[in-house]
């Protein structure tokens, strides 16, 4: 193992579409991959009227977007399907959504909002 990096050897597996796909619905997935590649866990879910519906969870191949993330956090603003990835065994058991606020640089003089 490389110092300071958690190696991912297994992830929580879940498939909401397990009957159609004829897979297990849930379990633990061993993560395979080239020795020189990093491995990650992922989770995808939907927010249906405030109710969280998990779509898939499992292992994810070497992806720079997942490097050094110990927590599985979606940062995109209101996607149709939420996705997060992380490094470390079973790190996709818990997942969360913290959208990054985009700071836009004003192209002209900033407008000061009027006080109420």
């Amino acid at each position: 193992a490389i110092l300071g990096r958690s190696e991912t050897q297994e992830c929580l597996f879940f498939n909401a579409n397990w009957e159609k796909d004829r897979t297990n619905q849930t379990g633990v997935e061993p993560c395979y991959g080239d020795k020189d590649k990093r491995r990650h866990c992922f989770a995808t879910w939907k927010n249906i009227s405030g109710s969280i519906e998990i779509v898939k969870q499992g292992c994810w191949l070497d992806d720079i977007n997942c490097y050094d993330r110990t927590d599985c956090v979606e940062k995109k603003d209101s996607p149709e399907v939420y996705f997060c990835c992380c490094e470390g065994n079973m790190c996709n058991e818990k997942f969360s959504y913290f959208p990054e606020m985009e700071v836009t640089q004003p192209t002209s003089n900033p407008v000061t909002p009027k006080p109420p």
Partner: antibody
Framework: EVQLLESGGGLVQPGGSLRLSCAAS????????MSWVRQAPGKGLEWVSA????????YYADSVKGRFTISRDNSKNTLYLQMNSLRAEDTAVYYC?????????????WGQGTLVTVSS | DIQMTQSPSSLSASVGDRVTITCRAS??????LNWYQQKPGKAPKLLIY???TLQSGVPSRFSGSGSGTDFTLTISSLQPEDFATYYC?????????FGGGTKVEIK
């Protein structure tokens, strides 16, 4: 070297049968999902069928369901596609492809393809 | 089934040009989006998986971007060996589906 090698293609009459084989080498065959993807002359890629590493789960495109059967023999590192009731529209180059293990499940290794021609 | 629509279906470009190919999914495929290159008479070759990760051995002039339903493959400086047909593919659900392809031809 990681390799896939298809065989079994040829000319067959409408309504006839053909069995394609795909010999795998250079990787742990039994732990990888495998697929057949076809390409009609001058057309794009069409996914045909897939099978899990153990062979316990099989999937088919609607266009071949009930006519084609995918199978594998992990002791021989070989993937098969049994094609029955062949139609003219099944004429294509058939590729076997490995669907790389964890997500996002891309086809990372392809065979060279074998041509199936259905004609009277 | 998830439909994948690619545009343009063909384009003409010169060596050194920046080329952009787009792919749209009929519903969100999250990050389960892959790109392939195919040359005449050859099998397809995986270029990019998971929207933006280059497969081993693929030159860095290739890049992928996008999210959800809209994706882009960019070749920053077209090389002679890049003239080929490019396909997007979703692996979010079964059946796996491909875009119709984009043929990149020499101008």
């Amino acid at each position: 070297e990681v390799q896939l090698l298809e065989s079994g293609g040829g000319l067959v009459q409408p309504g006839g049968s053909l069995r394609l084989s795909c010999a795998a080498s250079g990787f742990t065959f039994s732990s990888q999902g495998m697929s057949w993807v076809r390409q009609a002359p001058g057309k794009g890629l069409e996914w045909v069928s897939a099978i899990s590493g153990s062979g316990g789960s099989r999937y088919y495109a609607d266009s071949v369901k009930g006519r084609f059967t995918i199978s594998r023999d992990n002791s021989k590192n070989t993937l098969y596609l049994q094609m029955n009731s062949l139609r003219a529209e099944d004429t294509a180059v058939y590729y076997c492809a490995r669907e790389q293990g964890p997500g996002p499940y891309a086809f990372d290794i392809w065979g060279q393809g074998t041509l199936v021609t259905v004609s009277s | 089934d998830i439909q994948m629509t690619q545009s343009p279906s063909s384009l003409s470009a010169s060596v050194g040009d920046r080329v952009t190919i787009t792919c749209r999914a009929s519903q969100s495929v999250s990050r389960f989006l892959n790109w392939y290159q195919q040359k005449p008479g050859k099998a397809p070759k995986l270029l990019i998986y998971g929207i933006s990760t280059l497969q081993s051995g693929v030159p860095s002039r290739f890049s992928g971007s996008g999210s959800g339903t809209d994706f882009t493959l960019t070749i920053s400086s077209l090389q002679p060996e890049d003239f080929a047909t490019y396909y997007c593919q979703q692996s979010f659900s079964l059946p796996r589906t491909f875009g119709g392809g984009t043929k990149v031809e020499i101008k």
